[in-house]
Interface confidence: medium
């Protein structure tokens, strides 16, 4: 088993909003779940976008989870990981709002 | 540390207001976290109830309609529970607690306030 | 909603023994379940997070497991200390919602 590097960026978008984007790399076995949380629970699956679940080349996998929030609510953001029976939850890095 | 201490009346009579306050002592209430209101049924049943965030925004439980609110006073780092018209099965011991963004376990709860609905 | 069903809703064992108390969601809840303890008269005090993370100070005989829709939170080599109600939580969704608790007494 090889754990997962889980990165959250902040990208700038319009009218106020920015998408936040929670990448996962260098992971193996293939299985694994990766979710925006607001609030302590998870987002509806309609609010976040899922990219595939592809290898890098080195014999391990890569995926990403990305969803839109509001400028100056990074703060109620967290990115849940979990794979091969161990977890965590990743915040969205300060000084963006 | 932080310490969250629930206060209010024991007894209300049916079709009144339940009010009850949640002071909390070593931490802004604007800071961070979650700030709710749990109940505990005769029987033990646990019901959610609703926070409000540090932000001051709300999510209520939606078994309980348009009943309850749920606001603050950020001067007394205190936040409070109105729950309306209230009957006998909202008799129960009313917890308020605490969650932090990285998932909503409650990792800190007050002493129970028990609040009797009798005329 | 998610519903939470617990079993047993009661349960009698003796020190030293290993228990284990079940909780069912009625649907997917990917993990994200919390165990309490509460004893008579006192508040609920958290033991397990993220169905797997044991809490602050919680004794390394208590662990969960589970995932999907079944979960479990053992207790090796009861204490007596161990005495009182169990209770899991969801949070994967609003409303959050509890199990109807399991009764552990000692013999």
């Known amino acids: 088993t090889v754990p997962p590097m889980v990165n959250v960026t902040c990208s700038e978008v319009s009218e106020g909003n920015i998408t936040v984007t929670c990448r996962a790399s260098s992971f193996y076995p293939r299985n694994i779940t990766l979710t925006w949380r607001q609030d302590g629970v998870s987002l509806s699956h309609n609010t976040q976008q899922w990219g595939d679940v592809l290898p890098d080349g080195n014999g391990t996998y890569q995926t990403w989870v990305a969803t839109r929030i509001r400028q100056g609510e990074e703060q109620r953001f967290t990115c849940y990981m979990e794979h091969s029976g161990n977890h965590g939850t990743h915040p969205v890095p300060s000084g963006n709002s | 540390d932080v310490q969250l201490q629930g206060s209010g009346p024991g007894l209300v009579k049916p079709s009144q207001s339940l009010s009850l306050t949640c002071s909390v002592t070593g931490y802004s209430i604007t800071n961070d976290y979650y700030w709710n209101w749990i109940r505990q049924f005769p029987g033990n049943k646990l019901e959610w109830m609703?926070?409000?965030?540090?932000?001051?925004?709300?999510n209520y439980n939606p078994s309980l309609k348009n009943r309850i609110s749920i606001t603050r006073d950020t001067s007394k780092n205190q936040f409070f529970l109105k729950l309306s018209s209230v009957t006998t099965e909202d008799t129960a011991t009313y917890y308020c607690?605490?969650?932090d963004g990285r998932g909503a376990w409650f990792a800190y709860w007050a002493q129970g306030t028990l609040v009797t609905v009798s005329a | 909603d998610i519903q939470m069903t617990q079993s047993p809703a009661s349960l009698s064992a003796s020190v030293g023994e290993t228990v284990t108390i079940t909780c069912r969601a009625s649907g997917n809840i990917h993990n994200y379940l919390a165990w309490y303890q509460q004893k008579q008269g006192k508040s609920p005090q958290l033991l397990v997070y993220d169905a797997i993370t044991l809490a602050d100070g919680v004794p390394s005989r208590f662990s969960g497991s589970g995932s999907g829709t079944q979960y479990s939170l053992k207790i090796n080599s009861l204490q007596p200390e161990d005495f009182g109600n169990y209770y899991c939580?969801?949070?994967?969704?609003?409303?959050?919602?509890f199990g109807a608790g399991t009764k552990v007494e000692i013999k």
């Open positions: 609703g926070f409000i965030s540090f932000g001051g925004s709300n």
């Open positions: 939580q969801h949070f994967w969704s609003f409303p959050l919602t």
């Open positions: 607690a605490r969650y």
